[in-house]
Interface confidence: low
């Protein structure tokens, strides 16, 4: 049976949520339970994604759309359509091959995911540090020293930043 579509193709009018049965007699059969077809003219229905283990269901599967997963608490999504779940770390940490590690001095991470990033170098913009950085927060740059009123003092600028921490593998 040639798979080329035409107006006469028995499958061409089958809507999403149905499939054109392989026994060549049924025109449009509803997708069986736990399967879906998101487009018309399908010859099979796709098996619904199952959100198991570290994945949890964000949106149930229907006859016309796949299930959508997210991650259980303590994990976050990575990849298209949340194809992977990666362990959360605390703010001020990054995930390495050996687990969660504190950000090195001069770097910070204000999220539970991702890598530690260097503090902003205020002096590059000709500004001074208004609030020191921490492992969890970037520095806050203030006005340039020249803009400071007489007698005002600036906070000591941070040490030179290192390269960003390694990304999780």
């Amino acid at each position: 049976f040639e798979r080329t579509r035409s107006l006469q193709d028995p499958c061409s009018n089958c809507p999403a949520g149905t499939f054109c049965d392989n026994n060549r007699n049924q025109i449009c059969s509803p997708c069986p339970p736990n399967s879906f077809s998101s487009a018309g003219g399908q010859r099979t229905c796709d098996i619904c994604r199952q959100c198991k283990g570290v994945f949890r269901t964000r949106k149930e599967c229907s006859s016309t759309s796949n299930a959508e997963c997210d991650c259980t608490p303590g994990f976050h999504c990575l990849g298209a359509g949340c194809s992977m779940c990666e362990q959360d770390c605390k703010q001020g940490q990054e995930l390495t091959k050996k687990g969660c590690k504190d950000c090195c001095f001069g770097t910070f991470n204000d999220q539970k995911r991702g890598i530690c990033r260097p503090w902003t170098n205020c002096s590059l913009d000709g500004k001074s540090v208004l609030v020191n950085g921490t492992k969890e927060r970037d520095v806050v740059c203030g006005p340039s020293p020249a803009d400071l009123s007489p007698g005002a003092s600036s906070v000591t600028p941070p040490a030179p930043a290192r390269e960003p921490g390694h990304s999780p593998q």
Epitope: F1, Q8, N13, N23, N25
Partner: antibody, heavy 116, light 108 residues
Framework: QIQLVQSGPELKKPGETVKISCKAS????????MSWVKQAPGKGLKWMGW????????TYADDFKGRFAFSLETSASTAYLQINNLKNEDMAIYFC?????????WGQGTTLTVSS | QIVLTQSPAIMSASPGEKVTMTCSAS?????MNWYQQKSGTSPKRWIF???KLASGVPARFSGSGSGTSYSLTISSMEAEDAATYYC???????????FGSGTKLEIK
């Protein structure tokens, strides 16, 4: 149970029109195509074509293009075969059959006699 | 258009005898279906997708083949098997169906 019940025998003159019905029951009508098959007296089976009961699109075999028309009354789960401008060679038994690739249930057949 | 040639056109077999009839396609087809028709009745789907027996068909029947050559076999002929058997295929775009000319099987 699944049944295809066809209309009764027809006696027609050449040049007339006949419309044969095929009423389906026991399944969802629009899920299966409907084929039509001709069997002339003492001859074999000849596939005439089929109609997609979901879309209403008919497909005709080359020998049955022109005077032959398949139609549907979906609300009544009924398929029709109409033959216009009848000829002597149209004299045959006409079967409807559920499906299109390998029809699995067949009507009892409608005998069409064409005689002047 | 694919032409299906059945042979023999007519054959007879004694009860208990093995029977084989063939269907040759003018070009390669993906599968073959077989129908049984007894005089004065509607055809019945007998074998579909080359080798699958339709509901109620005795296990003494089998179907096989590929490409252009297909066959229907009865391992042990019985009186009730006397009938005409038609092969049928479906292919092309737009897809069309064709029947073979039939093999008439008689009981000796």
């Amino acid at each position: 149970q699944i049944q295809l019940v066809q209309s009764g025998p027809e006696l027609k003159k050449p040049g007339e029109t006949v419309k044969i019905s095929c009423k389906a029951s026991g399944y969802t009508f629009t899920t299966y195509g409907m084929s039509w098959v001709k069997q002339a007296p003492g001859k074999g089976l000849k596939w005439m074509g089929w109609i997609n009961t979901y879309s209403g699109v008919p497909t005709y075999a080359d020998d049955f293009k022109g005077r032959f028309a398949f139609s549907l009354e979906t609300s009544a789960s009924t398929a029709y075969l109409q033959i216009n401008n009848l000829k002597n060679e149209d004299m045959a038994i006409y079967f409807c059959a559920r499906g299109y690739g390998s029809p699995d249930y067949w009507g009892q057949g409608t005998t069409l006699t064409v005689s002047s | 258009q694919i032409v299906l040639t059945q042979s023999p056109a007519i054959m007879s077999a004694s009860p208990g005898e093995k029977v084989t009839m063939t269907c040759s396609a003018s070009s390669s087809v993906s599968y073959m279906n077989w129908y049984q028709q007894k005089s004065g009745t509607s055809p019945k789907r007998w074998i579909f997708d080359t080798s699958k027996l339709a509901s109620g068909v005795p296990a003494r029947f089998s179907g096989s083949g590929s490409g252009t050559s297909y066959s229907l076999t009865i391992s042990s002929m019985e009186a009730e098997d006397a009938a005409t058997y038609y092969c049928q295929q479906w292919s092309g775009n737009p897809p069309i169906s064709t029947f073979g000319s039939g093999t008439k099987l008689e009981i000796k």
